[in-house]
């Protein structure tokens, strides 16, 4: 079948990085600069993606593969193939329509992207809070009170207090 197909269609012999040039008796011509073909048998080469503006080149275009972009520092990729760059926030913040805002009390974000998530509720697992949560870090749950052997010193953390100068939103 492959042989018959190539007899019928000379273009099927053109490898990736070339195109089947109708203007030159269907011979395989190399892709012109700034273009590529990632599969064989193509009648045209695709234009290379250009990483410009807030995008920067992660991988250069070659005759057989497209360029790949990522984002300039302070931004991160969104979407398939990094179709958009979204601004980073600081840890302990989330991006809203009004820019980066601190996480509300009782929530945290340990990354520069994404939303603030509620602290883990240790009591749901029958555990106690070992380390209080912050805007940047989740609480750390410790053993349940029942797990502590008699006479073992149990640390009872103070009730979570609002951080100075931080009001819920």
């Amino acid at each position: 079948f492959e042989r018959t197909r190539s007899l019928q269609d000379p273009c099927s012999n053109c490898p990736a990085g070339t195109f089947c040039d109708n203007n030159r008796n269907q011979i395989c011509s190399p892709c012109p600069p700034n273009s590529f073909s990632s599969a064989g048998g193509q009648r045209t080469c695709d234009i290379c993606r250009q990483c410009k503006g807030v995008f920067r080149t992660r991988k250069e275009c070659s005759s057989t593969s497209n360029a790949e972009c990522d984002c300039t520092p302070g931004f991160h990729c969104l979407g398939a193939g990094c179709s958009m760059c979204e601004q980073d926030c600081k840890q302990g913040q989330e991006l809203t329509k009004k820019g980066c805002k601190d996480c509300c009390f009782g929530t945290f974000n340990d990354q520069k992207r994404g939303i603030c998530r509620p602290w883990t509720n240790c009591s749901l697992d029958g555990k106690s809070v070992l380390v209080n949560g912050t805007k940047e870090r989740d609480v750390v749950c410790g053993p349940s009170p029942a797990d502590l052997s008699p006479g073992a010193s149990s640390v009872t953390p103070p009730a979570p207090a609002r951080e100075p100068g931080h009001s819920p939103q």
Epitope: K52, G53, V54, F55, L78, C85, K97
Partner: nanobody, 122 residues
Framework: QVQLQESGGGLVQAGGSLRLSCAAS????????IGWFRQAPGKEREWVSC????????YYADSVKGRFTVSRDNAKNTVYLQMNRLKPEDTAVYYC???????????????WGQGTQVTVSS
Amino acid sequence: QVQLQESGGGLVQAGGSLRLSCAASGFSLGLYAIGWFRQAPGKEREWVSCIMSSDSSAYYADSVKGRFTVSRDNAKNTVYLQMNRLKPEDTAVYYCAAPQSDCFHYSENDYWGQGTQVTVSS
């Protein structure tokens, strides 16, 4: 033809001021957020400031907060970046950009200017 054009760059002594303009042609700049970026030689492009289209809310990088002010005059189809108390580390090519969505998201279809050189000497 849709175009953004920066102007107002130049050579200034440390502590001095400059006002950059970003003028739009071929589209209504008032419908877009406008971001300012800069790129120093051998360094990555860096976000500086942005002004929203809806309510003219302004946002600034920590490095320029309190020294730079962004404003817009939609009647003149222009956005301004007032730069005061300039430092040698502010030396860069300054670009304006009109993102399709808002101040915080940029795509490959956004409009960008060609840049204007700002040099701050000590």
